[in-house]
């Protein structure tokens, strides 16, 4: 099968990280540099992709596989792929058109990327605020305040929440 | 190998909004980043703007305010909406695999032209 | 924005012999990474753009060599080592270092 393959279309032999060369009667050439081929019997290779201005490269190119990219220092990135990179921001912020802006009073941002998001609403599960919310954490909500009747037992305050993990940039 | 085709209306009436589909085949949109260019008659060629396959964009500041660029991955195409169309917006508009977000335009539609016309 | 400014806007060439043709940017396109963010493109008559150099100088697959490219920083060279009656056509060159890419106004190679 791979000889019949090969005589209907020379093409198919070259492996990935070369491609079928039409100027030189469709011998597999390698790529050239900054290029690569992921897959065999490509008639041209893909020029690598490019990390420049706010992004840096966090895999370089080879000829069989593309380049990836990350973002600097200062910088997180965005969509599939890092296609964009973004400005950072403190906790207890968040990224607007004007620039980084202090969450609004009731919101939180934990995080340096992200929107401000608002203070958990204690009372709706029928609990009080035990910690009070910034704009960097959210609220802490304890027992409900029948819980709280004299005789009753003293509340030990819950560990403090974790935080969520940020991945590698 | 990948192929893009544009597809669209070929006459436009002043201030109203044209709109492109570029359809790829061959592989798949999603990866890499797809660019709008345009290249009114007899002159030079204009990069109009980027869009990755999950959505991110990137247009020229020269045309920001009237660009739009989506994508439908399910379909394998994106499009472009120019909005308050004029003369001057007359051009062959190509679409182009874009290898680095503004840079190394290596797979080309065949071209169309959109005439603004009344 | 970066500006590209090209010359000779127009070269008759006799076919067999070479020719070149000059770019400019308004600023370095050398990058950190030692990479000259620089692309040339060929418009045949009724057709599509195709890219020839990318990188300055790295020849795309398929591009016959007798195209070559050269330069760095703000001053780039198209050449050409021997005319064919198939290179006619609108030679660009742009750059790709930041957006938007910008190109230069064209230099119409036509055949004596």
């Known amino acids: 099968f791979e000889r019949t393959r090969s005589l209907q279309d020379p093409c198919s032999n070259c492996p990935a990280g070369t491609f079928c060369d039409n100027n030189r009667n469709q011998i597999c050439s390698p790529c050239p540099p900054n290029s690569f081929s992921s897959a065999g019997g490509q008639r041209t290779c893909d020029i690598c992709r490019q990390c420049k201005g706010v992004f840096r490269t966090r895999k370089e190119c080879s000829s069989t596989s593309n380049a990836e990219c990350d973002c600097t220092p200062g910088f997180h990135c965005l969509g599939a792929g890092c296609s964009m990179c973004e400005q950072d921001c403190k906790q207890g912020q968040e990224l607007t058109k004007k620039g980084c802006k202090d969450c609004c009073f009731g919101t939180f941002n934990d995080q340096k990327r992200g929107i401000c998001r608002p203070w958990t609403n204690c009372s709706l599960d029928g609990k009080s605020v035990l910690v009070n919310g910034t704009k960097e954490r959210d609220v802490v909500c304890g027992p409900s305040p029948a819980d709280l009747s004299p005789g009753a037992s003293s509340v030990t305050p819950p560990a403090p929440a974790r935080e969520p993990g940020h991945s590698p940039q | 190998q990948v192929q893009l085709q544009e597809s669209g209306p070929g006459l436009v009436k002043p201030s109203e909004t044209l709109s492109l589909t570029c359809t790829v085949s061959?592989?798949?949109?999603?990866?890499?980043?797809w660019s709008w260019i345009r290249q009114p008659p007899g002159k030079g060629l204009e990069w109009m703007g980027y869009?990755?396959?999950?959505?991110?964009?990137n247009i020229n500041p020269s045309l920001k305010s009237r660009v739009t660029i989506s994508v439908d991955t399910s379909k394998n195409q994106f499009s472009l909406k120019l909005s308050s169309v004029t003369a001057a917006d007359t051009a062959v508009y190509y679409c182009?695999?874009?290898?680095?977000?503004?840079?190394?335009?290596?797979?080309w539609g065949q071209g169309t032209l959109v005439t603004v016309s009344s | 924005e970066i500006v590209m400014t090209q010359s000779p806007l127009s070269l008759p060439v006799t076919p067999g012999e070479p020719a070149s043709i000059s770019c400019r940017s308004s600023?370095?396109?050398?990058?950190?990474?030692?990479?000259?963010?620089l692309d040339w493109y060929l418009q045949k008559p009724g057709q599509s753009p195709q890219l020839l150099i990318y990188?300055?100088?790295n020849r795309a697959s398929g591009v016959p060599d007798r195209f070559s490219g050269s330069g760095s920083g703000t001053d780039f060279t198209l050449k050409i080592s021997r005319v064919e009656a198939e290179d006619v056509g609108v030679y660009y060159c742009?750059?790709?270092?930041?957006?938007?890419?910008?190109f230069g106004q064209g230099t119409k190679l036509e055949i004596k």
């Open positions: 182009a695999r874009d290898q680095s977000g503004g840079g190394s335009f290596q797979h």
């Open positions: 061959g592989g798949s949109i999603s990866s890499y980043y």
């Open positions: 869009i990755y396959y999950s959505g991110s964009t």
């Open positions: 600023q370095s396109l050398l990058y950190s990474n030692a990479y000259n963010h």
């Open positions: 990188a300055g100088s």
């Open positions: 742009m750059q790709a270092l930041q957006t938007p890419p910008t």
